[in-house]
C-alpha cells in the first residue's frame, strides 16, 4: 500500500519558521504534489505550494521555499509572520498524486515534545496516519 | 480486472434520504482514492465527492457539503455515499469511480428526488 | 474553483475527418487535465489523463496538447465508433471541475 510520510519542525533559531518534508513510499512516479495547512486541500485546508515534476513549483505565503530533495520527497520552508504565521499546532498535509493511479496524502504537526526554546528534533518521526 | 458496481439508487422525496454503495473487485481496494461522480439527465458530469485510500481525508464540492457524506469499509471492498435533504437537483445518475484522475467507473444507479 | 470551458459544445463531422476540441481553465493547472468519452447510457471512459497520455487500451488517433490554461484534444481519424460525448476534467485540485462537454455527431 503506496504511504506518505510528513515530518514537521520548527527551526530553533527563527521561531516563526517551519521545515515541512514529505515523502512518498509507493512505486509509481509523482505526477503532483500539494502542500496545504489548516487540514487536506479541499477539505477546509489552504494550498501553500504544489510541485510539478516538469513544470515546476508553485507556492504562496507564507511558504518561503518548496523544493524537491529527491524523486519522491520534498520540503517546504514557512516563514510567517503575523496573521499568516503559523503555529505550534498548525496541522500541514501532504498530497502525492501519481496519475492516472490515484492520489495519497498524510497529514502531520509539530511533535508535541517539540520545545521552540530549544534546539527543534533533527530527525521527528514520519506520522503514522497516512492515507 | 477492475469491476465497480453501483446499488441503492431509486425514487425518494424531496428531503429524503438514500444510501448508495459501490462493491468493488479486481484491484486492492484499500490502496486507491476513490470517487463519486454525478449526472443529472441530459446533462454533463459533476464530482460529487472523494475518499482517501485508509478513509481518514474527504472531500465534498459546496453544492452537497453537509449533506452527503462519503465512507468506505475497506473490509468489505466497498464504498459508500449517504445523502440526506435531498433535492430535486440531486436527481442523477450516480457512479462510483477510482483512480486520480478517474480510470475506472461503474455502471451507475439512477436516483430520482421527486414528489 | 477552477472552471473548465469547453467548445466547441458540439460538431458534426464525417468518418475519416480530423477533430479538435478544446478547453481552458480559469487559472493555471499546469499539465493535470483529463479527457473522457462517453456515449449515450453509458458510464464515461478515460481517454487522455496529464494533459498527453493516453490511458490503458485508448488507441492512438487520441491525443492531448496544452498546458496552464489551454487544451486541446485531437482525433486524427475520426471512425464510426467516435461519435459521443466527450468532456476535459482538471485533476490539478479539488474540487474536480469537468468542461460541459462537447458533442461529436455524424454529418
Known amino acids: 500500500t503506496p504511504e506518505v510520510w510528513v515530518q514537521v519542525r520548527m527551526e530553533a533559531t527563527e521561531l516563526s519558521s517551519f521545515t515541512i518534508r514529505c515523502g512518498f513510499l509507493g512505486s509509481g512516479s509523482i505526477s503532483l504534489v500539494t502542500v496545504s495547512w489548516g487540514g487536506p486541500n479541499g477539505a477546509g485546508g489552504t494550498t501553500l505550494a504544489v510541485l510539478h515534476p516538469e513544470r515546476g513549483i508553485r507556492q504562496w505565503a507564507p511558504a518561503r521555499q518548496a523544493r524537491w530533495e529527491t524523486q519522491s520527497s520534498i520540503s517546504l520552508i514557512l516563514e510567517g509572520s503575523g496573521a499568516s504565521s503559523p503555529c505550534a499546532n498548525t496541522t500541514f498535509c501532504c498530497k502525492f498524486a501519481s496519475f492516472p493511479e490515484g492520489s495519497w496524502e498524510a497529514c502531520g504537526s509539530l511533535p508535541p515534545s517539540s520545545d521552540p526554546g530549544l534546539s527543534a528534533p533533527p530527525t521527528p518521526a514520519p506520522i503514522l496516519r497516512a492515507d | 480486472e477492475v469491476q465497480l458496481v453501483e446499488s441503492g439508487g431509486g425514487l425518494v422525496k424531496p428531503g429524503g434520504s438514500l444510501r448508495l454503495s459501490c462493491a468493488a473487485s479486481?484491484?486492492?481496494?484499500?490502496?486507491?482514492?476513490l470517487s463519486w461522480v454525478r449526472q443529472a439527465p441530459g446533462k454533463g458530469l459533476e464530482w460529487v465527492s472523494e475518499?482517501?485510500?485508509?478513509?481518514?481525508?474527504?472531500y465534498y464540492p459546496d453544492t452537497v457539503t453537509g449533506r452527503f457524506t462519503i465512507s468506505r469499509d475497506n473490509a468489505k471492498n466497498t464504498l459508500y455515499l449517504q445523502m440526506s435533504s435531498l433535492r430535486a437537483e440531486d436527481t442523477a445518475v450516480y457512479y462510483c469511480?477510482?483512480?486520480?484522475?478517474?480510470?475506472?467507473w461503474g455502471q451507475g444507479t439512477l436516483v430520482t428526488v421527486s414528489s | 474553483d477552477i472552471q473548465m470551458t469547453q467548445s466547441p459544445s458540439s460538431l458534426s463531422a464525417s468518418v475519416g475527418d480530423r477533430v479538435t476540441i478544446t478547453c481552458k481553465a480559469s487559472q493555471d493547472v499546469m499539465t493535470a487535465v483529463a479527457w473522457y468519452q462517453q456515449k449515450p447510457g453509458k458510464a464515461p471512459k478515460l481517454l487522455i489523463y496529464s494533459t498527453s497520455y493516453r490511458f490503458t487500451g485508448v488507441p492512438s488517433r487520441f491525443s492531448g496538447s496544452g498546458s496552464g490554461t489551454d487544451f486541446t484534444l485531437t482525433i486524427s481519424s475520426l471512425q464510426p465508433e467516435d461519435f459521443a460525448t466527450y468532456y476535459c476534467q482538471q485533476h490539478y485540485s479539488t474540487p474536480r471541475t469537468f468542461g460541459g462537454g462537447t458533442k461529436v455527431e455524424i454529418k
Open positions: 469511480a477510482r483512480g486520480d484522475p478517474f480510470g475506472y
Open positions: 479486481g484491484f486492492t481496494f484499500s490502496s486507491y482514492g
Open positions: 475518499i482517501s485510500s485508509g478513509g481518514t481525508y474527504t
